[in-house]
Interface confidence: medium
């Protein structure tokens, strides 16, 4: 769960409906899957599929479930204790240094290099120099057999693999 929580992440709820489970806070904190009531006396359960909390907390609202973008697949749904798990579609990957973006995997290595790793949802293809065997860092979108120009529009934090 991200340490940075903004107002937008919180899912405002109505006063606890009868079906919402209540329990008492332990040392001022409520267990995962719950948030604390405004008066601090009760722990109110999150709503399945709508919001969640992963840790013991004193949040007034549970966190809103993430919705997978149309360029992602949902690996597991949002529960009261865990956010939705989304993964880049086949043929795209999410970089470590910009984890919000899925990028199209390259389809070949630059001239003089060989492919040693496939495209996965977590990494682009891996290329090494034929002679030295050293890894290639930095993106070269051109594929050996085709003269290409680098695609213009940047990776998107919206629909991630359009």
């Amino acid at each position: 769960e991200s340490a940075l929580i903004t107002q937008q992440d919180l899912a405002p709820q109505q006063r606890a409906a009868p079906q919402q489970k209540r329990s008492s806070p332990s040392e001022g904190l409520c267990p995962p899957g719950h948030h604390i009531s405004e008066d601090g006396r009760d722990c109110i359960s999150c709503k399945y599929g709508q919001d969640y909390s992963t840790h013991w907390n004193d949040l007034l609202f549970c966190l809103r479930c993430t919705r997978c973008d149309s360029g992602e697949v949902e690996l597991s749904p949002c529960t009261t204790t865990r956010n939705t798990v989304c993964q880049c579609e086949e043929g795209t990957f999410r970089e470590e240094d910009s984890p919000e973006m899925c990028r199209k995997c390259r389809t070949g290595c630059p001239r003089g290099m060989v492919k040693v790793g496939d495209c996965t949802p977590w990494s682009d293809i891996e290329c090494v120099h034929k002679e030295s065997g050293t890894k290639h860092s930095g993106e070269v979108p051109a594929v050996e057999e085709t003269v290409t120009s680098s695609p213009g529009t940047p990776a998107s934090p919206c629909s991630l693999s359009g």
Partner: antibody
């Protein structure tokens, strides 16, 4: 220079099928997604679907599912849109367009005009 | 489907005028993880194909003149042309990419 060259005007009979083509130059289609967009006279734009030519994966707007089929031939850097059981509702200009990692379309073909006669 | 509604449907302007057009979506286009609005604007001149002007609601595509500005967040977006030129006469479409793409009905910019 990035270009998408589309096949010309297609006059077809109602009930028939048609296959429109879109040939890319200046880039490898396997490095992008290719989309098809429909535009009827005096009407707005409707997204039909897209293909990832690297693996053949397609995604369609539900209203075009079963009606439209998008395929790619990476050896000729060409993407196709096939329509079956044509009706007057299918008469429109069809554009192919390129998306790199997004559902925004940064380059477009010049459009293929499809006319359907009874 | 996310429904995109543009207004006005047409707009008569004089050269040099400042013009704004609106685009509203039936649900928020703000991606909660990335804080980006998944909205683009296109320009389509008569007899031509659409051209991408703005993406992520406010980022200008390279080569687009800086008189074109996109703004807004959530469900309400605006395209502003600070000083309309004769070559700007066209239909302008907004498009969401939060879900499978849908376009607004367009705003036609005409000369007075």
């Amino acid at each position: 220079e990035v270009q998408l060259q589309q096949s010309g005007a297609e006059p077809v009979k109602s009930g028939a099928s048609v296959k429109l083509s879109c040939t890319a130059s200046g880039f490898n289609i396997k490095d992008t997604f290719i989309h098809w967009v429909k535009q009827r006279p005096e009407q707005g734009l409707e997204w039909i679907g897209r293909i990832d030519p690297a693996n053949g994966n397609t995604k369609y707007d539900p209203k075009f599912q079963g009606k439209a089929t998008i395929t790619a031939d990476t050896s000729s850097n060409t993407v196709y849109l096939q329509f079956s059981s044509l009706t007057s509702e299918d008469a429109a200009v069809y554009y192919c367009s390129r998306g790199t990692t997004v559902y925004y379309f940064d380059h477009w073909g010049q459009g293929s005009t499809l006319t359907v006669s009874s | 489907d996310i429904v995109m509604t543009q207004s006005p449907s047409s707009l008569a302007v004089s050269a040099g005028e400042r013009v704004t057009m609106s685009c509203k979506s039936s649900q928020s286009l703000l991606n909660s993880r990335t804080r980006k609005n998944c909205l683009a604007w296109y320009q389509q001149k008569p007899g031509q194909f659409p051209k991408l002007l703005i993406y992520w609601a406010s980022t200008r595509e390279s080569g687009v003149p800086d008189r074109f500005t996109g703004s807004g967040s959530g469900t309400d977006f605006t395209l502003t042309i600070s000083s309309v030129q004769a070559e700007d006469l066209a239909v302008y479409y907004c498009q969401q990419s939060f879900d499978l793409p849908t376009f607004g009905g367009g705003t036609k910019l005409e000369l007075k």
